[in-house]
């Protein structure tokens, strides 16, 4: 054992910015720090075989498999992958260790498998085995967190049954409204599963992993706040846990809180109370109503009453299946070139949706905001005044929803012209869609006022540029106009544009553009 070389096997993960295929290399790219793969002599194997811990990488990842050999003298080597030999160029690092690397760029299924490295040193021969597979991301999930009471303690545990294991954090805020936005200084984040401080104004739990981030807010009725104009509504699916927090502050401890469902007191074991004194010596009480797994009969009005505050209620609706309620009829908008405008979709959904806005095959992030009436709204303002079709798509575990919008930008026409031996064509993109006129310029009509009506064919093209209709007009050439200058004009309510064409033999044509407002 003492005579064997000290072998270190490492994996280096690279930031993806290259696209060649696997190659043996001694100079890897800019990368993360090397990760030890615990290379060890494989038990009961004939010959000296070292094995590295199995490696699982994402598809398209770029990695380097590297071996560092602490052995005297020169080494020679050979990589073998799927019965093919690959060139191997060892070099020596600053500690005089032999370094052999295999770079795999943009990992694909064909590059997954066993990589064998044969090393010959002055003292001995040995083999190093790497096994590389592609991680099955189809098994990844990210589930919305839910709450459980911690046994024997007044604390909440946040649970998200996700793969890979998510990082769970509590997001706490003691201000009202807008100042509780995610990046506000009023927001405190605690990266732990258990929360003991349950008196805050706004309490959310978030779980994040490779798939993104999902959050759940602790539904709260605050008896010191003016009730909303519409009754707050909480949706849950059968089997999910119900948690409602009732919070009240009073000048002293002489008050109590109770929960009722449809005028019947909640059973013991379905609520627990906590109280504390705030900094100004007022008493804060909170009373949790909870059901570990809801059934249809848990639907109803949950009312929190206090001996010193007006009572407030929330409607809890238990559904068999999630839903997305919104009007899916398509909407058309017409705006001026510099007018401020946002698309918006108002919807009611449970569980919370994931959504995207799409334009010209490009997806944009989607933000949603809860409204006081139980509805949510998603707005999209980043259209940069590009006309075309915009698509809002939303989905949750049980439902999907798509809504189409068309944006038209009011604009004076811009004319482009082209000509061939037999015809002249003009194109324009203005909105509203322009109308066309053709005029002939001659000695009799130097200002090009003589209108051409014969041989003109107008059409609204079915192709779109950035989702925008292009209108065109074509003039078939006749002997009567050959050799003359003609002018095509496109006009709409915002103005007119013209282009002048010399009709002669085919070839490049001089076009003179006129812009007439």
């Amino acid at each position: 054992n003492q005579d064997l070389p000290v072998i270190k096997c490492v994996l280096i993960n690279h930031k993806n910015n290259d696209s060649s295929v696997g190659k043996s290399s001694s100079y890897p790219m800019v990368s993360e720090s090397p990760e030890d793969l615990g290379c060890a002599l494989r038990p009961q194997s004939s010959g000296t075989v070292y094995e590295a811990a199995a490696v699982e990488v994402d598809v398209s990842a770029s990695i380097t498999l590297q071996v560092l050999v602490d052995a005297p003298g020169n080494i020679s080597c050979l990589w073998v992958f799927k019965h093919s030999s690959l060139n191997c160029q060892p070099h020596f690092d600053l500690q005089n260790r032999g370094v052999v690397s295999m770079v795999i760029l943009k990992m694909t299924e064909t590059q997954a498998g066993e990589y064998l490295l044969f090393i010959q040193s002055e003292a001995t021969n040995y083999t190093i085995l790497f096994t590389v597979s592609i991680r099955n991301t189809l098994l990844y999930t990210l589930r919305r967190p839910y709450f459980r009471k911690m046994e024997n303690q007044d604390a909440l545990v946040c649970i998200s049954e996700s793969v890979p294991e998510p990082i769970v954090e509590w997001v706490l805020c003691d201000s009202q409204g807008e100042s509780c936005k995610e990046e506000s200084p009023a927001v405190v984040k605690k990266e732990e599963k258990v929360l003991h401080e349950l008196f805050g104004t706004d309490i959310r739990c978030c779980a994040r992993n490779e798939l993104g981030r999902e959050c759940t807010r602790l539904f709260t009725i605050d008896l010191n706040q003016t009730p909303q104009t519409t009754l707050p509504q909480l949706f849950l699916k059968v089997g999910e846990p119900l948690w409602i927090r009732c919070k009240a502050v009073h000048v002293n401890h002489g008050f109590g809180l109770t929960w009722e469902l449809e005028n019947k007191a909640l059973e013991e074991g379905n609520y627990f109370e906590m109280s504390t004194y705030s900094t100004n010596r007022t008493m804060i009480r909170i009373l949790f109503a909870f059901v570990s797994s809801v059934a249809r009969n848990d639907t109803g009005y949950y009312t929190c009453s206090s001996s010193k505050h007006p009572s407030q209620s929330a409607l809890v609706t238990i559904v068999e299946k999630g839903f997305i309620n919104a009007t899916n009829s398509s909407e058309d908008y017409e705006i001026d070139q510099y007018e401020e405008f946002c698309f918006s979709v108002r919807f009611k959904a449970y569980p919370q949706i994931r959504c995207t806005w799409t334009f010209s095959r490009k997806s944009f992030p989607c933000e949603q905001k809860g409204l006081d009436n139980g509805y949510s709204i998603s707005k999209f303002c980043n259209h940069k005044h590009q006309p075309g079709e915009y698509i809002f798509h939303a989905e949750n575990d049980d439902a999907q929803f798509t809504k189409m919008f068309t944006l038209n930008i009011r604009r004076k026409p811009q004319v482009l012209a082209e000509a061939s031996a037999s015809q002249a064509s003009c194109f324009s993109d203005g909105y509203p869609l322009p109308s066309w006129t053709w005029k002939k310029c001659s000695d009799k009509s130097p200002n090009c006022t003589e209108e051409i009506t014969e041989g003109v064919w107008n059409r609204k093209a079915n192709r779109k540029v950035f989702g925008q209709w292009v209108s065109s007009s074509t003039l078939n050439m006749s002997e009567a106009i050959k050799g003359f200058l003609v002018k095509c004009c496109a006009y709409n309510s915002l103005g007119t544009s013209c282009e002048t064409i010399l009709l002669n033999s085919p070839g490049p044509f001089p076009f003179i553009q006129d812009n007439i407002s």
């Epitope: 990760e35 060890a40 038990p43 811990a53 199995a54 699982e56 793969v163």
Partner: antibody, heavy 124, light 107 residues
Framework: QVTLKESGPTLVKPTETLTLTCTFS??????????VSWIRQPPGKCLEWLAH???????SYSTSLKSRLTISKDTSKSQVVLTLTNMDPVDTATYFC????????????????WGQGTMVTVSS | DIQMTQSPSSLSASVGDRVTITCRAS??????LAWYQQKPGKAPKRLIY???SLQSGVPSRFSGSGSGTEFTLTISSLQPEDFATYYC?????????FGCGTKLEIK
């Protein structure tokens, strides 16, 4: 250089929850198939295995302590966290974390590298 | 759970002696057994894995043998630095289990 380091409170009261963090460097649970275990050793007594977490997030727990243990990992921070609820003076021990590589040909070399350990005393 | 019974629980020996420590598993664990050495106030250090494979950097006086349920750790010629406590660990199935140790003392 592969290292593991345990951290957490040195003193906890009975009935409280103990949270220990194992911070490691030189390897990761992101790409290599590796696992990290927690092991404890009461003063002058035997080693007792507590829990293990695999790189794919599977977990395994000691039969006798299963109801009180939770193991989790934060790959981005290179940390594995152990919580042990409802602490009792008999839980006084040195707590170690250790790494276990997994090899594709179906063998394992058990724990090849250990942390130095952290002593936890349970007393009121 | 698989029980690991280690014997003896302690033993006295002199420098140069040949020492054997035994570990018995309550069921077949193939060769999924490792031996560890622990010195006071330190973490355990792996000596042998897969029942008989010597850890890189560990002196060749240490050897392991056995398969199934009976395993032995042998130190062919004790050195002063070998006085410590030795543990076996089965990692054939979860929950993992350690033997309760053999304390090797100077005679």
């Amino acid at each position: 250089q592969v290292t593991l380091k345990e951290s957490g409170p040195t003193l906890v009261k009975p009935t409280e929850t103990l949270t220990l963090t194992c911070t490691f460097s030189g390897f990761s649970l992101r790409y290599a198939r590796m696992g990290v275990s927690w092991i404890r050793q009461p003063p002058g007594k035997c080693l007792e295995w507590l829990a293990h977490i695999f790189s794919n997030d599977e977990k395994s727990y000691s039969t006798s302590l299963k109801s009180r243990l939770t193991i989790s990992k934060d790959t981005s921070k290179s940390q594995v966290v152990l919580t042990l609820t409802n602490m009792d003076p008999v839980d006084t021990a040195t707590y170690f974390c250790a790494r276990m590589p997994e090899y594709s040909s179906g063998w394992s070399g058990a724990f090849d590298i250990w942390g130095q350990g952290t002593m936890v005393t349970v007393s009121s | 759970d698989i029980q690991m019974t280690q014997s003896p629980s302690s033993l006295s020996a002199s420098v140069g002696d040949r020492v054997t420590i035994t570990c018995r598993a309550s069921q077949d664990i193939r060769n999924d057994l490792a031996w560890y050495q622990q010195k006071p106030g330190k973490a355990p250090k792996r000596l042998i894995y897969a029942a008989s494979s010597l850890q890189s950097g560990v002196p060749s006086r240490f050897s392991g043998s056995g398969s199934g349920t009976e395993f032995t750790l042998t130190i062919s010629s004790l050195q002063p630095e070998d006085f410590a406590t030795y543990y076996c660990l089965q990692h054939n199935s979860y929950p993992l289990t350690f033997g309760c140790g053999t304390k090797l003392e100077i005679k």
